[in-house]
């Protein structure tokens, strides 16, 4: 069985301020089981944008229905983009662990740039 891969097909996305940004991510397998998370930035200071498991992320919606048992699409849409949202976004697969889930594999990242709102 091939090992799971995290695919972020776009290296960069450009969005006008005030619009929504869609960041695409797909898995090649459901195994190992564990949640998907999205982060802005890398390393210790990265910012959690979305956690499949828990939390309230009012600006984030998932493109696909994550409650489907066979879902492999973990793309998200972030509403009302501002210049402060610019950065590189990573889709990260965790495998289950105790007490904490363990980072398993990350996508290559998608750089979000924000254009000035058209006048």
């Amino acid at each position: 069985e091939d090992e799971l891969q995290v695919i972020q097909p776009e290296k960069s996305v450009s969005v006008a301020a005030g619009e929504s940004a869609t960041l695409r991510c797909a898995m090649t397998s459901l195994i190992p089981v564990g949640p998907i998370m999205w982060f802005r930035g890398a390393g210790a200071g990265r910012e959690l944008i979305y956690n499949q498991k828990e939390g309230h992320f009012p600006r984030v919606t998932t493109v696909s229905e994550l409650t489907k048992r066979n879902n492999l699409d973990f793309s998200i849409s972030i509403s009302n983009i501002t210049p402060a949202d610019a950065g590189t976004y990573y889709c990260v697969k965790f495998r289950k662990g105790s007490p904490d889930d363990v980072e398993f594999k990350s996508g290559a990242g998608t750089e979000l740039s924000v254009r000035a709102k058209p006048s």
Epitope: L30, I31, P32, V33, P35, Q52, K53, E54, E65, L66, T67, K68, R69, N70, R95, K96, S98, P99
Partner: antibody, heavy 118, light 107 residues
Framework: DLQLVESGGGVVRPGESLRLSCAAS????????MSWVRQAPGKGLEWLAG????????YYIDSVKGRFTISRDNSKNSLYLQMNSLTAEDTAVYYC???????????WGLGTLVTVSS | ALTQPASVSANPGETVKIICSGG??????YGWYQQKSPGSAPVTVI????KRPSDIPSRFSGSASGSAATLTITGVRVEDEAVYFC???????????FGAGTTLTVL
């Protein structure tokens, strides 16, 4: 308070049909996958079917595939189980259950009893 | 199939462990469900291997390792007497399964 209330159980003859309902309240029903689980007298729990939050995807245990149909109406906060060609082996208490993000169960209804007898 | 002992017993205050085996660690999540009488509504005491719902006492804990999951009740009480079912979700088959149940008797 979160509540799941099943209804529609009763006594039917072999070969007949029954439709169970589960009324949900106290949470955003349309955001959660749901399942039906049953328990035959003196037996353990048996998962029967699950349905995604939007209702587009359904999943069944082999023994009920083709006979039972799970569905939902998010506008009515309701889950359903249509059961056809019932046999004595379908006699059980039927529970609806809310699924967690990873398809386990966090909340259960009180159950409704289905008796199939001639 | 999930395998768990048919019965366990303990004195009040003791620690009880119920082991459920039969799943593959990398494709399976486990839960534990308490049923105080036949036909009564099950109550989830553990989901996602080790997550305890907020209304469940802290004496209940769960863990998973290899092909087994364990429910631990630390300082068991008389009101914990019940049948405990382990359950599993398999990400390969999309199917939920349950063990046959373990009857806990508090002496």
């Amino acid at each position: 308070d979160l509540q799941l209330v099943e209804s529609g159980g009763g006594v039917v003859r072999p070969g007949e049909s029954l439709r169970l309902s589960c009324a949900a309240s106290g949470f955003t029903f349309s955001s959660y996958a749901m399942s039906w689980v049953r328990q035959a007298p003196g037996k353990g729990l048996e998962w029967l079917a699950g349905i995604s939050a939007g209702g587009s995807d359904t999943y069944y245990i082999d023994s009920v595939k083709g006979r039972f149909t799970i569905s939902r109406d998010n506008s009515k906060n309701s889950l359903y189980l249509q059961m056809n060609s019932l046999t004595a082996e379908d006699t059980a208490v039927y529970y609806c259950a809310r699924e967690t993000w990873n398809h386990l169960f966090d909340y259960w209804g009180l159950g409704t009893l289905v008796t199939v007898s001639s | 199939a999930l395998t768990q002992p048919a019965s366990v017993s303990a004195n009040p205050g003791e620690t009880v462990k119920i082991i459920c085996s039969g799943g593959d660690y990398y494709s399976t999540y486990y839960g534990w469900y308490q049923q105080k009488s036949p036909g009564s509504a099950p109550v989830t005491v553990i989901h996602s291997d080790d997550k305890r719902p907020s209304d469940i006492p802290s004496r209940f804990s769960g863990s998973a390792s290899g092909s087994a999951a364990t429910l631990t009740i630390t300082g068991v009480r008389v009101e914990d007497e019940a049948v405990y079912f382990c359950g599993a979700y398999d990400g390969r088959t999309y199917i939920n399964t349950f063990g046959a149940g373990t009857t806990l008797t508090v002496l």
